[in-house]
Amino acid sequence: DSSKWVFEHPETLYAWEGACVWIPCTYRALDGDLESFILFHNPEYNKNTSKFDGTRLYESTKDGKVPSEQKRVQFLGDKNKNCTLSIHPVHLNDSGQLGLRMESKTEKWMERIHLNVSERPFPPHIQLPPEIQESQEVTLTCLLNFSCYGYPIQLQWLLEGVPMRQAAVTSTSLTIKSVFTRSELKFSPQWSHHGKIVTCQLQDADGKFLSNDTVQLNVKHTPKLEIKVTPSDAIVREGDSVTMTCEVSSSNPEYTTVSWLKDGTSLKKQNTFTLNLREVTKDQSGKYCCQVSNDVGPGRSEEVFLQVQYAPEPSTVQILHSPAVEGSQVEFLCMSLANPLPTNYTWYHNGKEMQGRTEEKVHIPKILPWHAGTYSCVAENILGTGQRGPGAELDVQYPPKKVTTVIQNPMPIREGDTVTLSCNYNSSNPSVTRYEWKPHGAWEEPSLGVLKIQNVGWDNTTIACAACNSWCSWASPVALNVQYAPRDVRVRKIKPLSEIHSGNSVSLQCDFSSSHPKEVQFFWEKNGRLLGKESQLNFDSISPEDAGSYSCWVNNSIGQTASKAWTLEVLYAPRRLRVSMSPGDQVMEGKSATLTCESDANPPVSHYTWFDWNNQSLPYHSQKLRLEPVKVQHSGAYWCQGTNSVGKGRSPLSTLTVYYSPETIGRR
């Protein structure tokens, strides 16, 4: 209810004689700050005095703290929130109930905390997962309901009394909810750990033993097996007997089935721990093992390799590889099933014994045509000699020889001609089945080994062919040496590097990219007029009249090629300036007169200036000077100046005459 003080702390704390107790505690008083605090041991309420009786372990009042038990008991709290306590060292007779008597200005409260102090350090508790399986990582937990700042402890893990290699993670809790020390060990148990004893040992800071807890590991695992064979080397001859025995060294839980496997396949009706093979045949050679299962899964023994010995069987020859390419290496392998392996071989070529060849393999590093034919062999081991089996045929093959590309056309070849080539060869095994041509193009092959190039390109330089059977043999490339008119003719200005101004020295170059034949002639033309026959066209002092459209022509014995028209532009200052007057140079007063500054300039005039007969500049800057209404006083000589990016030019004087109107004359 709302009349209670609110406390939070562990319900019971555990310790042992000589250790310490740290009591984490928080509280909230009903009103105001704490004024008095008394820590009782086993407090009892006295109805007569309306007070609590019991041993006072600690006392704190407004007047100051009363030293108690030489600071063995400490109140580490404050006046409004914290009520943490420490008892160091703690004694057996501290067991029981601690009473925290709290008083504020108007309220009182007694809070009880249980303390359980044992005579000796109590053991930790090991927690195991419900099931442990071999090779599956598990976490072993060791929990001790104790932790105190003033008394460091450690938890150590032992397996059969020996410290465990795996790193443990130790954590402590000293909170109002719980007080404990915990060690967690991650561990991947093997089957051999089954039945072993794991210990969690509590030690003090110096490693001195305090207490421990032990558990026996119950590690579930598949059966672990041992296989024995008689005879022990598992080598017998056909007709002998063999016994294999399977024994379980460990299984948890108990095993439920047993079977035998040969080369990984289960043997039917063999469900005992002993396998008896009577009068064995060579087919019974192989790898044997026993498989025993329990609820975890199957376990397999090591494999026993049973070898049933017999004389070589009729042999066969394997050729690596036939057909063989002339010049390549070939290996012949004599294959004969035998146990033990054959120790000696006899080789035959076309029925004739090959001297000095006694190995399983015959290696010929460089095959020649005469090596073709039938190869056979005979194998021999300690139990006898085999029979000569059917031979193997060696076929020696080679790529087409002496391949040439032949041009069928008369020479020279000109751009646009139709060119026919043929691909010839001397000999081939196997027969030629196809031809290849380099480079590739959209060309016709009217018949096998013939190539027709319609409209041959100027850049078709060389052609090569290959005659192909299983391999392709390439001929040396032949040059078509295609002749063509000059290509990519263009006009290029050599000087000046920048724009052309009147009076500059100008050079134009007639360029082309290629020509075959190389001997060429040049022609320069402007507006249909021949100007020169050199590769360059030079102007010592260019004039505006030289501007226009220029072309150059380059020709050889095949034809001629013209450049695109190239425009020559000449920049010059305004020239030929004159002032024209409209409607004329004699105008009646009151009318309108327009003066126009006419000029020839490249680039066009960008700025005009007008001057009168006194060389006085007028405030007009456009090409036309409009006087309206014109007055007699406007009579006089005018001139203009034109300006562009190249320079300035001026006109001669032009006189404007303004005469009186009849009205003015009439008034006089």
Epitope: G195, E247, V248, S250, S251, E254, T256, F273
Partner: nanobody
């Protein structure tokens, strides 16, 4: 379920011999690892000897080594404990036990799932 029955116990003089037999049924006999244990009055159960399925592995306690011999006949589904040079301290109830967990922990009674009733062996001085 495996049933185990012992026989062959009795009274014998110090230095004498006895042969105990252990018959098992319910499973093929070569599936079973067989062990002999004894318990004297007021004492804990003690391991005596054990034999693997085929007889390839045999284990003895130090106290009986050289005097007792364990063997088995899988064709007759029986195991034997031949006890020679008997001493008064060999007096106990001898129990035969069987298991299908392998021989690696054959000396530990908690590995055995199937037990006989036991047969009394008394060695008088």
């Amino acid at each position: 379920e495996v049933q185990v029955v012992e026989s062959g116990g009795g009274l014998v003089q110090t230095g004498g011999s006895l042969r105990l037999s252990c018959a098992a049924s319910g499973r093929p006999f070569d599936w079973l690892t067989v062990g002999w244990f004894r318990q004297a009055p007021g004492k804990e159960r003690e391991f005596v000897a054990a034999i693997s399925q085929s007889g390839g592995r045999i284990f003895y306690s130090d106290s009986v080594k050289g005097r007792f011999t364990i063997s088995r006949d899988n064709a007759k589904n029986t195991a034997f404990l031949q006890m020679n040079s008997l001493k008064p301290e060999d007096t106990a109830v001898y129990s035969c036990a069987a298991q299908m967990r392998g021989y690696s922990r054959a000396a530990y009674p908690d590995e055995y799932d199937y037990w006989g009733q036991g047969t009394q062996v008394t060695v008088s001085s």
